[in-house]
Amino acid sequence: AIVFIKQPSSQDALQGRRALLRCEVEAPGPVHVYWLLDGAPVQDTERRFAQGSSLSFAAVDRLQDSGTFQCVARDDVTGEEARSANASFNIKWIEAGPVVLKHPASEAEIQPQTQVTLRCHIDGHPRPTYQWFRDGTPLSDGQSNHTVSSKERNLTLRPAGPEHSGLYSCCAHSAFGQACSSQNFTLSIADESFARVVLAPQDVVVARYEEAMFHCQFSAQPPPSLQWLFEDETPITNRSRPPHLRRATVFANGSLLLTQVRPRNAGIYRCIGQGQRGPPIILEATLHLAEIEDMPLFEPRVFTAGSEERVTCLPPKGLPEPSVWWEHAGVRLPTHGRVYQKGHELVLANIAESDAGVYTCHAANLAGQRRQDVNITVATVPSWLKKPQDSQLEEGKPGYLDCLTQATPKPTVVWYRNQMLISEDSRFEVFKNGTLRINSVEVYDGTWYRCMSSTPAGSIEAQARVQVLEKLKFTPPPQPQQCMEFDKEATVPCSATGREKPTIKWERADGSSLPEWVTDNAGTLHFARVTRDDAGNYTCIASNGPQGQIRAHVQLTVAVFITFKVEPERTTVYQGHTALLQCEAQGDPKPLIQWKGKDRILDPTKLGPRMHIFQNGSLVIHDVAPEDSGRYTCIAGNSCNIKHTEAPLYVVDKPVPEESEGPGSPPPYKMIQT
């Protein structure tokens, strides 16, 4: 059987505070617990929710939590169900409300000497006790002319007189707390001799040099006095007018007329009514001078056909608030339809091309009128004038691809090459009309090109294939001067390309035929063994059918390549002595020798007194210093080849001889002695 270890119990609770109804069960099998409120299952909310088996209240609510709660435990498998004892809350609360007139039925019926009853609509549990106030002062029960009924929460004034006039409020307190009236009641019982407002002046806005009228009336017995004052407390009468109010007239009924209003007349006007008794009544009204500022400029707008767009017209600052309307072609727009005005907005629904044009926003008030134009362009999808065509472009010449389109506004054209956007550079240029110029066509320009023409309304694109017509050319052009090593094998290559594969052949410039040991193998001139007679001028001729022939002239020199007869050696010299680095080379043509010391070429004309290069190529350095140490390179070159060899130079301090060493003792390393 299911047994309740803890059952919920009825308890006091405070409105808006936490509470917990406990429930704990013990059962042989698994059970689930749910709660009922007045027999209906309780749904979890953030405010009231199951916490384990118990029911937790984050904030007790006197309306939603009134009733009987019951904890139900159910074994879903067996269907057994057990129910706890019922529990409910005694919820303590207090809630503010207004002070209302209970008797008579309406304020209009309140007359001097009638009974007036006010009710305080503060409620609570337990029932609170009430305190009444007039103009913030507590009213004690049993005072003359009023009675307080706490049970009915009423305050009765009998008979009510002018002395009872004032602001009535109430407060109530109970064990839960306290609250004061949310809305108070102003009781006004007129004293006939007090001035009362019949007609109050209203703020007015007038244009410069127009007239303004303020109305003001009071009533009392006997009749009250009425006086007008301007801002600086200057009285305005028909006999004494301030200098700046020369055109002011006060009428017998109390109205004030101002004619030809100027800026200095703007300000606050006070109408003061004074009865035989009671305080003066001061009514204020302001005279404003109408004004209107300029309107901000519109940016031109581009819209797409078929869409819905809005253009907002911000009215200029002005007094009174300027009215705004839209016009097109001199006609005011309607408030409904396809192109219409909604509030300050121009609305274009399902835009057509014919809607393009100038629309004008007008703003006007008493001070004048302002207008501002907005230019509306209806964008169209571009259409083709000329699509790019598959083209054959000549290598080395400028090439053009057309992309001519038309649309509103003028379309933007971009080009892609192999799906990559072409950015304008020295080789590519896009003209204003969309045509692409390739400044000097190269072989690898033969690919797909795509142009895209766009407006805000959409885009069109087309592509074309470019085929490059290769010019007949040597690839690469043969070097015009070449050397061959005497008595060795040599080759001179010559290759060319063109629209058709060219035929390549060599011939001697003088027209004589090639000797038998020289062969022409598909453009490569082959010398089995170079002789002196092989030197001379040769011509490589490349030709094909459509492009004719081209020639390249080559001067072949036969040379004995450079060899070193004497090479510089690793040298160590005492500081202040002379160093000699020998170098001698041979070859044909006879090689020239240059020296490089410490990574710079030694110019024979700028060597100075310490250095000298001999005719045979040797380098001498006098009075060597430590900074002369380093690697020295001998470079031998002629018109056919160049060769180099290097050796280090070490400059060392001369040792001071010790006594044990005789004058004939050898130095510790190989030296040049000078």
């Epitope: 749910y34 299952p41 749904q43 139900v72 879903d76 067996t78 269907g79 169900e81 057990a82 129910r83």
Partner: antibody
């Protein structure tokens, strides 16, 4: 022995009424919840409603208004009153205590 | 209206196979775990297999197991036996004492 026996099924014309009974033995209804479940021929199980230990009833949305569950604790019997019957109400009607204990079912045929 | 969807509606398998049936609810069940699984054979009343999502009913073999929470649940048969070919139903219990069944999954021999 704890068991449930349904009765009252049979043939009824469309628009007619029928009251099914589920008699419990071996336990007291006042401590248990009782379900009615039906199964149309060749179709799946469909929950009709429940009566809890206090006698409060809850129904599937489609059953509200036409079907009423009640009980007589002195007779230890639960009832299913079915009104305005339609052809689609043809099914075997089971009563069940909790999830575990089920009756053998009674067939209701609605046909003209 | 609460809708409980079982998948698949029909399932063919062989003895020894591992079988998984899923049950998805249009809203969470009470306490996130008040879900039961039944087995029914033709002409018989349904038999309780699993209650409270994963608790095995008395006398049910341990090859049956259940899991899930909230609105998504599964029934697993770890190694199918000849006696297991039947129709399986999930049943949810919802806030407000409302119950609902899935449309059923018919398990047949491959």
């Amino acid at each position: 022995e704890v068991q449930l026996v349904e009765s009252g099924g049979g043939l009824v014309q469309p628009g007619g009424s029928l009251r099914l009974s589920c008699t419990a033995s071996g336990f007291s209804l006042s401590n248990y919840v009782m379900n009615w479940v039906r199964q149309a021929p060749g179709k799946g199980l469909e929950w009709v409603g429940i009566i809890d230990s206090s006698g409060s009833t809850y129904y599937a949305s489609w059953a509200k208004g036409r079907f009423t569950i009640s009980r007589d604790t002195s007779k230890n019997t639960v009832y299913l009153q079915m009104n305005s019957l339609r052809a689609e109400d043809t099914a075997v009607y089971f009563c069940a205590r909790g999830l575990y204990l089920w009756g053998q079912g009674t067939l209701v045929t609605v046909s003209s | 209206e609460i809708v409980m969807t079982q998948s698949p509606s029909t399932l063919s398998a062989s003895v020894g196979d591992r079988v998984i049936i899923t049950c998805q609810s249009s809203q969470s069940v009470y306490n996130n775990n008040l879900l039961a699984w039944y087995q029914q054979k033709p002409g018989k009343a349904p038999k309780l297999l699993i209650y409270y999502t994963s608790n095995l009913a008395s006398g049910v073999p341990s090859r049956f197991s259940g899991s899930g929470s909230g609105a998504e649940f599964t029934l697993t048969i770890s190694s199918l036996q000849p006696d297991d070919f039947a129709t399986y139903y999930c049943q949810g219990h919802y806030n407000g004492n409302i119950y609902a069944f899935g449309q059923g999954t018919k398990l047949t021999v491959l």
